[in-house]
Interface confidence: medium
């Protein structure tokens, strides 16, 4: 008979997903854990496997603003939603005193909460009676499984359990409860508790009749094989302890903060002996989607703690570097992307002599106002593009003489190094600057993509030739000091909205990956 | 109890018979393979022997126009007709995404399709549930045989499985499934899968309870005795691996392209131990007649292919210069187009440290066999592309040291000027040659596009670094004198059909206009 034990411990109010280091989630595409994601994985396993228990080994309480505000009500609510089968009391469950445990959690939980080594006395005894139990027998498929709980006997030094709870030695307290389970013909027994890995191992060794130990408190990470994240395993999962009576007892723990879901498969024979055990903690990373209903509930609870433009147009798999540190000093891939979109938006194959009417683009680096980070699942939205191109301009078509273009490129670097906006990004142009030369004579090579050709290739710019160029209306109008364009242009046709040009291109391409490819060089 | 395992792998849509080198059949009297011939041999063995399984180890998808047009429907139809007993998923089964696997194949196959190490998550989990299985127990005569599947964990880098499939380590995933089969009293277990010969051997060594491994992916040819055709055996058939628990586990593979039918006879004892194994791949040459009914069906399906090859895939507004006068002497825009398509076909954004796993392409100019004229309304058809790439090759992924790449570029121009095919076209590479220098020392600049970067840009090639490169299988196998690639490559994964890669890119782009942009220069 095979049992799947899913287990968490030391979740410490990480109800929402977190960064890899279990701090506040910043970059959602790299975030981990959280109850919505945990539920997805638990449900997946419940659907796939017949005999599943979901257990928590304590210390759900304490750790984020969630606990500060909701004081444990959030624990009961979301653990109920996830249909936990049992929980052991951890030391932090007493952080708000016994009342802070009884009211929000013990009275609201729809699952048994356990500890065999906590004994109530005085007036508390009757008040807390039945709200937590030493053990619980759970039906699982056609079998029954006994769960016996324990809590660190150090809790009075670690939390606020008050004077009416006695924390006994774990092993001393557990043995009679296990013996009782045996007399009830329960032959499969899990010790679930919160005393740390060393105590977990001692329980496995010393408590006769315990088949499996599921622990917490020490945030122990166990793993068999190559670990999937940054945690270094303290041993194999499960950690096998040979009991004093010669049995192999698997001991497990699942690190902390809901980053992993412990996954242990146990095979029992007909007499309840463990005949095999294997598994591993499952890293709850972003490859596991967050369950939408739980996520919605989280978002609803979240309020108390604190449409086109947001839709995805396409994806980037590279960082779109629209920073002024790049685009005002050197070729930047955001500039290349925008220029490529501008050319693509102007394909007009009208004549067999010309592959296209225009092949060149120039774009003032200062007009690129923001980068786009690819680490948001690569998503690019209109909102993102509006930050890059916030001025609501157009991308226009002009006709210029080669000599005008040469002047424009000299202007591009006439006061290079001062982070000024006139530094030109390009498409269909290869330019080489020599900054050691005097301003006005720094362009040492200027090759442009032919249009009157069947195979586009680069030829030196001819001063007297007339070229078509796509550029922002801002430049056509002489902006950023490009007076020569305004003064010398031979024709100017206003074009499409800048954001629209780029968004259309991205939608068409679906996935983009512009490079810095040597359009602009310095000799 | 004796079992006959008939097996194929890496058939790559060779539904029709092929030439001896697995390219298009020219002289029918000397052609080999094809499903009609395969069926004849399978039926002959089924009639002669009592306990026969016909298995496929993946990569039926991708390789000829059959796949381009029928998108997997042809695989389901003809594998059903041949009454395959089981198939493992290969990486290429995901080339058209998960939908392209589910609809034509998973939903239509009358045989189980297997993979134990692919786990579905998110919305896909319920959609794909039951359509592929980790294992299947097949009745064979009076016995049962468990078949457990596996797929290369590199699939996310080699194909398009999307984000809702997790490819686990093969051994880690297989063990629990094999254990489950054991608990079901299945004592004869075949691991059928697609991860390459090295992994096949590891599975045989490490996965307790696997009796036989039937593999694919590496196109491994094994043979005992004198081989019957041009393939050189990598070892004896079966290849015997001693498992960690001391069993002798036969491992087999049957080359590729349906040229051979693997034939393995296994003798099991009453406890399901393999006590003997022997066999050999059977060369499906013209001495085996094609089955008339299957052949008639093939001819019926063929009609749609002829129609497809004349339909427009997309348009070019430039002349696609695939002339030998250009591509064997200098950068040609047909070479750029093909390399750009090769990179685009290999976008697998798996890791934030890397914008992509591969950025470089090389392509022997001699492999470009025709230009495409844009003056036919710009139309590009499959027929046009088949003239450019007539050899039915694949565009493969290799790992090479920088020093090997440097040797390859020296070889590219070692006898420059004689119109020889080894002149390399490139993508993600900027190379400068000085032909005045002596052969072997002509590469004066070799810059390559970074992958471990968020903004792709060009850096000098490092001799000791390992790079991934996309190239034709012809080059990976040392063709055109590129012996250094064959001898020094560190990894080789076969890729998609060459024409299919370019046609998909053109269909996606709709309008293309590749330029000669300075990737290859002469100083």
């Amino acid at each position: 008979w095979e049992l799947t034990i899913l287990h968490t411990n030391d979740v410490h109010s990480r109800l929402e997903q977190t960064s890899e280091d279990s701090s506040k989630c910043v970059n959602a595409s790299r975030c981990m854990g959280g109850v919505a994601r945990l539920f997805t994985k638990v449900q997946q396993i419940r659907r796939a496997e017949p005999n599943v228990l979901l257990l928590d080994a304590g210390d759900q309480y304490q750790g984020t603003i969630w606990f500060t505000v909701y004081k444990g009500a959030e624990v009961a609510h979301f653990m109920n939603a996830l249909r936990y089968d049992a929980m052991a009391l951890g030391n932090h469950e007493f952080d708000n005193g016994v009342e802070g445990l009884i009211e929000p959690l013990l009275k609201e939980a729809k699952f048994p909460i356990l500890s065999a080594n906590i004994k109530a006395k005085g007036p508390l005894a009757s008040q807390i009676s039945g709200l937590y139990l030493p053990y619980k027998v759970l039906p699982v498929g056609d079998e029954v499984v006994g769960i016996v709980g324990y809590t660190s006997k150090e809790t009075p030094f670690l939390s606020n359990p008050g004077t009416n709870l006695v924390f006994e030695d774990e092993i001393t307290a557990l043995q009679p409860e296990v013996d009782k389970l045996k007399t009830l013909n329960v032959n499969k027994i899990i010790a679930l508790g919160h005393s740390g890995f060393e105590t977990d191992k001692l329980i496995a060794q010393k408590v006769r009749g315990v088949d499996v130990v599921v622990g917490g408190h020490s945030n122990t990470f166990l793993y068999t094989g190559n670990p999937p994240s940054k945690e270094v395993p303290a041993g194999k999962y499960p950690f096998i302890v040979t009991s004093d009576d010669g049995r192999k007892v698997p001991v497990v723990q699942a690190y902390a903060f809901g980053k992993y879901l412990g996954y242990l498969k146990i095979e029992f024979d007909e007499r309840g002996n463990v005949i095999s055990s294997h598994g591993n903690p499952i890293l709850l990373n972003s490859s596991i989607p967050e369950d939408p209903s739980i996520k919605a509930d989280i978002n609803k609870w979240r309020i108390k703690l604190d449409n086109y433009s947001t839709q995805e147009l396409g994806k980037t798999i590279v960082y779109l570097d629209g920073s002024s540190q790049s685009c005002r000093f050197r070729e930047c891939n955001m500039g290349n992307l925008i220029c490529d979109a501008m050319i693509n938006n102007n394909l007009r194959h009208a004549d067999e002599m010309f592959w296209n009417h225009v092949s060149m683009c120039i774009l003032n680096g200062g007009g690129i106002r923001s980068p786009i980070d690819e680490r948001n699942n690569g998503t690019i939205t209109w909102e993102n593009l509006a930050a890059v191109l916030p001025f609501g301009g157009t991308f226009d078509l002009v006709q210029l003489k080669g000599s005008t273009l040469k002047k424009a490129f000299e202007h591009s670097v006439h006061r290079y190094g001062q982070s000024t906006g006139e530094f030109l990004q390009v498409g269909g142009i290869h330019v080489v600057y020599d900054l050691s030369r005097k301003p006005g004579d720094r362009v040492v090579k200027l090759d442009v993509l032919c249009t009157k050709c069947r195979v586009p290739s680069y030829d030196p710019l001819k001063m007297d030739e007339i070229y078509k160029v796509i550029l922002p209306n801002f430049l056509a109008n002489g902006g950023d000091g490009f007076q020569m364009i305004k003064d010398e242009l031979l024709r100017h046709d206003s074009g499409d909205q800048d954001i629209n040009v780029v968004s259309t291109y991205i939608s068409k391409m679906k996935v983009i990956y512009p490079a810095v490819e040597g359009r602009i060089k310095f000799s | 109890w004796e079992l006959t395992i008939l097996h194929t792998n890496d058939v790559h849509s060779r539904l029709e018979q092929t030439s001896e080198d697995s390219s298009k059949c020219v002289n029918a009297s000397r052609c080999m393979g094809g499903v009609a011939r395969l069926f004849t041999k399978v039926q002959q063995i089924r009639r002669a022997e009592p306990n026969v399984l016909l298995l496929d180890a993946g990569d039926q998808y991708q390789g000829t126009i059959w796949f381009t047009v029928y998108k997997g429907a042809e695989v389901a139809h003809f594998m059903n007709a041949l009454r395959y007993d089981a198939m493992a998923l290969g990486n290429h089964e995901f080339d058209n995404g998960v939908e392209g696997l589910i609809e034509p194949l998973l939903k239509e196959a009358k045989f189980p399709i297997l993979s134990a190490n692919i786990k579905a998550k998110g919305p896909l989990a319920s959609q794909i549930s039951g359509l592929y299985l980790p294992y299947k127990v097949l009745p064979v005569g009076d016995e049962v045989v468990g078949i457990v599947g596996y797929t290369s964990k590199e699939t996310p880098f080699l194909s398009n499985p999307g984000t809702n499939l997790v490819f686990e380590d093969e051994i880690t995933a297989l063990q629990p499934e094999v254990d489950k089969l054991k608990t079901l009293n299945v004592n004869k277990i075949i691991a059928l899968g697609h991860s390459g010969f090295e992994t096949d051997k590891l599975i045989a060594q490490k996965v307790r309870g696997v009796d036989v491994v039937v593999g694919g992916h590496s196109n491994t040819f094994l043979y005992t005795g004198n081989p019957p055709s041009k393939e050189v055996p990598a070892g004896k058939y079966p290849f015997i691996v001693t498992s960690d628990d001391g069993r002798k586990v036969p491992v087999v593979q049957a080359y590729a392209f349906g040229k051979y039918l693997g034939y393995l006879k296994i003798e099991f004892d009453e406890r399901g131990n393999v006590i003997s194994s022997h066999g050999n791949p059977i060369l499906l040459n013209s001495s085996i007649p094609e089955d008339p009914s299957i052949k008639a069906d093939i001819n019926k399906w063929r009609i749609k292919l002829d129609n497809y090859s004349t339909q427009e895939l997309g348009k070019t507004i430039v002349y696609l210069d695939g002339s030998s006068q250009s591509c064997r002497f200098r950068e040609c825009n047909m070479g750029n187009l093909i390399c750009d398509a090769m990179i685009n076909n290999n976008l697998r954004h798996a890791d934030e440290m890397f914008w992509n796993h591969v950025s470089m392409c090389i392509l022997n100019g001699g492999g470009i066999r025709s230009p495409i004229d844009e003056r036919n309304n710009g139309t590009i058809t499959w027929e046009n592309l088949a003239a450019v790439l007539p050899f039915g090759g694949t565009f493969d992924l290799v790992q090479l040291k920088g020093s090997t790449l440097k040797k390859a570029f020296e070889h590219s121009v070692h006898r420059y000027g004689q119109s020889t095919g080894e002149f390399l076209q490139v993508g993600g590479i900027h190379v400068v040659y000085d032909l005045s220098r002596k052969p072997g020392d002509r590469v004066v600049k070799l810059d390559v596009l970074c992958t471990k970067c968020r903004v792709p840009s060009y850096d000098p090639l490092k001799m000791d670094e390992i790079y991934k490169v996309i190239l034709p299988n012809f080059l990976a196998n040392g063709g055109d004198g590129f012996q250094m690639i064959k001898d020094e490559l560190l990894r080789h994964d076969s890729g998609d059909q060459d024409i299919n890669v370019v046609s998909t890119y053109i269909s996606k782009m709709k309008v293309i206009y590749p330029a000669v942009e300075g990737r290859i220069k002469f100083s």
Epitope: - | I240, G246, D269, I275, S276, S277, H278
Partner: antibody, heavy 120, light 106 residues
Framework: EVQLQQSGPELVKPGASVKVSCKAS????????MNWVKQSHGKSLDWIGY????????SYNLTFKGKATLTVDKSSTTAYMHLNSLTSEDSAVYYC?????????????WGQGTLVTVSA | SIVMTPTPKFLLVSAGDRVTITCKAS??????VAWYQQKPGQSPKLLIY???TRYTGVPDRFTGSGYGTDFTFTISTVQAEDLAVYFC????????FGAGTKLELK
């Protein structure tokens, strides 16, 4: 049905040699190693070695290297053991034996044995 | 080479007895152990392989167990036709037989 039929008893003089045959039938001869085992009178069993009929490759117990030579004739599905420089120590019953399978040497099929007596 | 040492060398039995023979390997041989029965004037017969797997047609009163260096062969209820010599054999490294245990009638 698998059968191994050995040649008859041999009486040979010291220093001479002898060739014992083992005719196999009822199975694919080339697919299974043929092993040879010595049993001295009233004693245990000693493995001599095996030959792989497929390719003629052989493996010997070091004790018998130089003493025994194993050969096969695939066309007649017969295995042979040649013993040379015989002494009284070589007097024994010699068995050919085939494994249950071709991996592990579990001898499921045995010849009837050939008695070799070395005597002046 | 690996030495297989059986215990005892002789065993006097009556019909219906339970008989256990052990065989100790001089080093670990995993479970690569077989047991044979040989009657006078006959070739040996394979009874057990892989230490515990009964060969086809062998009655279930014959069982084997063990792993590593210590192996046991048991006849649960001896019958008259079981009187014979029993050999253990390892093929973990090269191939060696034990000296044999002779079952005789009391």
């Amino acid at each position: 049905e698998v059968q191994l039929q050995q040649s008859g008893p041999e009486l040979v003089k010291p220093g001479a040699s002898v060739k014992v045959s083992c005719k196999a039938s009822g199975y694919a001869f080339a697919s299974y190693n043929m092993n040879w085992v010595k049993q001295s009178h009233g004693k245990s069993l000693d493995w001599i070695g095996y030959i792989d009929p497929y390719n003629g490759g052989s493996s010997y117990n070091l004790t018998f290297k130089g003493k025994a030579t194993l050969t096969v004739d695939k066309s007649s599905t017969t295995a042979y053991m040649h013993l040379n420089s015989l002494t009284s120590e070589d007097s024994a019953v010699y068995y050919c034996a085939r494994g249950y399978g071709n991996y592990k040497a579990w001898f499921a099929y045995w010849g009837q044995g050939t008695l070799v007596t070395v005597s002046a | 080479s690996i030495v297989m040492t059986p215990t005892p060398k002789f065993l006097l039995v009556s019909a219906g007895d339970r008989v256990t023979i052990t065989c100790k390997a001089s080093q670990s041989v995993s479970n690569d152990v077989a047991w044979y029965q040989q009657k006078p004037g006959q070739s040996p017969k394979l009874l057990i392989y892989y230490a515990s797997t009964r060969y086809t047609g062998v009655p279930d009163r014959f069982t084997g167990s063990g792993y590593g260096t210590d192996f046991t062969f048991t006849i649960s209820t001896v019958q008259a036709e079981d009187l014979a010599v029993y050999f253990c054999q390892q093929d973990y490294s090269s191939l060696t037989f034990g000296a044999g245990t002779k079952l005789e009638l009391k």
